[in-house]
């Protein structure tokens, strides 16, 4: 008789999840000489150990500590780029501006980017059918807890000026419920971080409003100021031209607003 299996509201574990994590780890350590010492099999074992045989609604940050330890990485603390709801542009930017880093440019972020995973209580199986949805099922699921853990550590490591890319096309440009709004903002260390600078990315071709005056940006400014961190904001009106000018700053068309 087939055993009853919990049906969750979210998509199941990404197919070929173990192979993907292992392959990404090998690729990352080959590209980043400072991480060549990392044993990818141990990384996978630690990753697996965080959620296998555990109830997928009862995962804690503690479960991920062995993985965090193995994935410890030093990035220049003054070159951190956070993002909220605009991942693709943030990643395109750091691909060009190689000395800046998003979380997904670190080993742990790179391993898990765009993947889903969960296990089942008391069995060593990975659940490829469904995984808990953060809203509909539970927040303490393997994926959410992972990102909360790595995001907190990433924010804690930041210093000097921290940049964040925000999506100016959304109704809430700054969303208190996003990972940035609920985790990263509150884990920037005022004794190390001088300024948080928001880059608001515009969507419309001829949208010339100053979105730095948006009420949600003012809310972010208020939260940050109360934490004794200065706040600064820039509009990026033309993301396409912005990336072009990052690649080619000496271009004469890059002296006026983008």
């Amino acid at each position: 008789v087939p055993r009853w299996r919990q049906q969750w509201s979210g998509p199941g574990t990404t197919k070929r999840f173990p192979e993907t994590v292992l392959a990404r780890c090998v690729k990352y350590t080959e590209i980043h000489p400072e991480m060549r010492h990392v044993d990818c099999q141990s990384v996978w074992d630690a990753f697996k150990g965080a959620f296998i045989s555990k109830h997928p609604c009862n995962i804690t940050e503690e479960d991920y500590q062995p993985l965090m330890k193995l994935g410890t990485q030093t990035v220049p603390c003054n070159k951190i780029l956070l993002w909220s709801r605009i991942k693709d542009l943030a990643h395109q930017f750091t691909q060009v501006q190689r000395d800046m880093f998003t979380l997904e440019d670190t080993l742990l972020g790179y391993l898990a980017d765009d993947l889903t995973w969960c296990g089942e209580f008391n069995t060593s199986k990975i659940n490829y059918q469904s995984c808990p949805d953060w809203r509909k099922d539970c927040s303490n699921n393997p994926v959410s807890v992972f990102w909360k853990t790595v995001s907190r550590r990433f924010a804690e490591a930041a210093c000097d000026v921290v940049h964040v890319m925000l999506n100016g096309s959304r109704s809430k440009i700054f969303d208190k419920n996003s990972t940035f709004g609920s985790v990263e903002v509150h884990n920037l260390q005022p004794e190390k971080v001088q300024t948080l600078e928001a880059w608001v990315i515009h969507g419309g071709r001829e949208d010339s409003r100053d979105l730095c005056q948006d009420p949600t940006i003012k809310e972010l400014e208020s939260i940050i100021s109360k934490r004794n961190i200065q706040f600064s904001c820039k509009n990026i009106y033309r993301p396409d031209k912005f990336l072009q000018c990052v690649k080619n700053p000496e271009d004469s068309s890059c002296t006026s607003e983008i």
């Epitope: 501006q97 000026v161 940049h163 001088q194 300024t195 600078e197 880059w199 001829e206 010339s208 100053d210 730095c212 200065q230 600064s232 904001c233 820039k234 509009n235 990026i236 009106y237 912005f242 000018c245 990052v246 080619n248 700053p249 000496e250 004469s252 068309s253 890059c254 002296t255 006026s256 607003e257 983008i258």
Partner: antibody, heavy 123, light 112 residues
Framework: QVQLVQSGAEVKKPGSSVKVSCKAS????????ISWVRQAPGQGLEWMGG????????NYAQKFQGRVTITADESTSTAYMELSSLRSEDTAVYYC????????????????WGQGTLVTVSS | DVVMTQSPLSLPVTPGEPASISCRSS???????????LEWYVQKPGQSPQLLIF???NRASGVPDRFSGSGSGTDFTLKINRVEAEDVGVYYC?????????FGGGTKVEIK
């Protein structure tokens, strides 16, 4: 709150080079364009070029291309302007100026200026 | 390069009276986003320049409301509605639309 403090006056021989520094304090440094503007004695203002430190590459006015190098050191929040092959016409006060806008990639909107550095070129 | 032409060269004024400076550009400074990339600066004797007006008509922070900027495209005006003794100095317009940024030749405002 933002302050730009420039290095002291220089006297140089024709054909030599001069390097003027501009140290920023207060506010952020990396994402704001820093320009260099010069003013010959009794004359008007002339934009030489500028740099956005986070991107590292400078823009230059054609007139100074090949003779001027603008750089920035993010670790010390300092911008530099080096002018080579000096001639007597380069005798001027050299100002650094920083944009203060919420527009990205803006040269102009110079809300903050250094105190100026007098460079005298004389044999 | 965009050529900026200012007039008059010199402007003797009486305190309490209005003053007006004209600036003309060799090409339109109106960007596709609807903003005119024209700025006004004043350089008081022995000082660094200071920003008065940006984007054609916006007063910079801390600038008294007796200063106003107007105009669009190629013709711009800076008005001081009641000149005060502290307003003496050289006033420059500058275009920030394209590289290289270029300044007008300056207008010297002095008290009669």
């Amino acid at each position: 709150q933002v302050q730009l403090v420039q290095s002291g006056a220089e006297v140089k021989k024709p054909g030599s080079s001069v390097k003027v520094s501009c140290k920023a304090s207060g506010g952020t440094f990396s994402s704001y364009a820093i320009s260099w503007v010069r003013q010959a004695p009794g004359q008007g203002l002339e934009w030489m070029g500028g740099i956005i430190p986070i991107f590292g590459t400078a823009n230059y006015a054609q007139k100074f291309q090949g003779r001027v190098t603008i750089t920035a050191d993010e670790s010390t929040s300092t911008a530099y302007m080096e002018l080579s092959s000096l001639r007597s016409e380069d005798t001027a006060v050299y100002y650094c100026a920083r944009d203060s806008s919420s527009w990205y990639f803006t040269y102009g909107y110079f809300q903050h200026w250094g105190q100026g550095t007098l460079v005298t070129v004389s044999s | 390069d965009v050529v900026m032409t200012q007039s008059p060269l010199s402007l003797p004024v009486t305190p309490g009276e209005p003053a007006s400076i004209s600036c003309r550009s060799s090409q339109s400074l109106l960007n596709s986003n609807g903003y005119n990339y024209l700025e006004w600066y004043v350089q008081k004797p022995g000082q660094s320049p200071q920003l008065l007006i940006f984007l054609g008509s916006n007063r910079a922070s801390g600038v008294p409301d007796r200063f106003s900027g107007s105009g669009s495209g190629t013709d711009f005006t800076l008005k001081i509605n009641r000149v005060e003794a502290e307003d003496v100095g050289v006033y420059y317009c500058m275009q920030a639309l394209q590289s290289p940024l270029t300044f007008g030749g300056g207008t010297k405002v002095e008290i009669k």
